[in-house]
């Protein structure tokens, strides 16, 4: 297992619709053809997996159908979007990148992006 540098923004504020996007950029030491990207959430020293996708270079990222994540790749950058976020989901979202094929295997973990989420104000009842 070899180490690899992963960069991501320090702080992002989600939209009022609970959507947050950020770029995860990795310094690929070679010509990887198969890459695995995992988003981890750290809150109160507990780490949980949010979503993961394996993709072939040049192809789209495919997350599971019920995943809250979507993403696109371009070179050594992965643009990740997390949807359906609520205030309670505020936390540090860490990007983990693995170069799966060809060998050698490389692993890189970012410092994390603190995503802040605020629940939208409830709409006032309207009279018709």
């Amino acid at each position: 297992c070899k180490a690899m540098h992963v960069a991501q923004p320090a702080v992002v504020l989600a939209s009022s619709r609970g959507i947050a996007s950020f770029v995860c950029e990795y310094a690929s030491p070679g010509k990887a053809t198969e890459v695995r990207v995992t988003v981890l959430r750290q809150a109160d020293s507990q780490v949980t997996e949010v979503c993961a996708a394996t993709y072939m270079m040049g192809n789209e990222l495919t997350f599971l159908d019920d995943s809250i994540c979507t993403g696109t790749s371009s070179g050594n950058q992965v643009n990740l979007t997390i949807q359906g976020l609520r205030a309670m989901d505020t936390g540090l979202y860490i990007c983990k990148v693995e170069l799966m094929y060809p060998p050698p295997y490389y692993l890189g973990i970012g410092n994390g992006t603190q995503i802040y989420v605020i629940d939208p104000e409830p709409c006032p009842d309207s009279d018709f």
């Epitope: 702080v11 504020l13 109160d44 603190q114």
Partner: antibody
Framework: QVQLVQSGAEVKKPGASVKVSCKAS????????ISWVRQAPGQGLECMGW????????NYAQKLQGRVTMTTDTSTSTAYMELRSLRSDDTAVYYC???????????WGQGTLVTVSS | EIVLTQSPDFQSVTPKEKVTITCRAS??????LHWYQQKPDQSPKLLIK???QSISGVPSRFSGSGSGTDFTLTINSLEAEDAAAYYC?????????FGPGTKVDIK
């Protein structure tokens, strides 16, 4: 080294608007947020809200909603705070501060005194 | 919004004395509590982040502790240059909020 440099002091009449700038240097501007904090004479610190320089999303203090607008110009690494319909109780020193990874305000501008007086 | 209360409001201390300032949150904020020092006519300065993490360039006599709702800033062996206002600040949830501040002066 990280630096935040703010625009100069302003004197405004009640009902007018003021726009304060905060030019950042020494770091990747879009990786962090910029918060605006004000301090009335002899009073404590009041968080006005902040802007995510990465995507331009904002979160404002409820009491200022509708009167304040925070923006960024990523091409010049500058943040702006505009406050409208000024009142005498808006007289304060206005600070910008960088929002770090844990939400801490790790670097501060030198402050901009805004005086609202008729 | 989360309300922070600080005590005491004011403290007059002799040099070399130990100073303890407390900050209490209206609900649990984990470790998302930061401490600032503000000297007269100066911008605030970050002293401690994330409840207990020290900041490069800040003297080691400043330390922080606590989690959840109760936090403490300790100044071991106060020096004359430590005369200032001290503020706590939470970043656990939006909107960010500050405590009312504690003024420390030298006897």
């Amino acid at each position: 080294q990280v630096q935040l440099v703010q625009s100069g002091a302003e004197v405004k009449k009640p009902g007018a608007s003021v726009k304060v700038s905060c030019k950042a240097s020494g770091y990747t501007f879009t990786s962090y947020g910029i918060s605006w904090v004000r301090q009335a004479p002899g009073q404590g610190l009041e968080c006005m809200g902040w802007i995510s320089a990465y995507n331009g999303n904002t979160n404002y203090a409820q009491k200022l909603q509708g009167r304040v607008t925070m923006t960024t110009d990523t091409s010049t690494s500058t943040a702006y705070m505009e406050l409208r319909s000024l009142r005498s109780d808006d007289t304060a020193v206005y600070y910008c501060a960088r929002v770090g990874r844990f939400g801490e305000f790790d670097y501060w501008g030198q402050g901009t005194l805004v005086t609202v007086s008729s | 919004e989360i309300v922070l209360t600080q005590s005491p409001d004011f403290q007059s201390v002799t040099p070399k004395e130990k100073v303890t300032i407390t900050c209490r949150a209206s609900q649990s904020i984990g470790s998302s509590l930061h401490w600032y020092q503000q000297k007269p006519d100066q911008s605030p300065k970050l002293l401690i982040k994330y409840a207990s993490q020290s900041i490069s360039g800040v003297p080691s006599r400043f330390s922080g502790s606590g989690s959840g709702t109760d936090f403490t800033l300790t100044i071991n062996s106060l020096e004359a240059e430590d005369a200032a206002a001290y503020y706590c600040h939470q970043s656990s949830s939006l909107p960010f909020t500050f405590g009312p501040g504690t003024k420390v002066d030298i006897k």
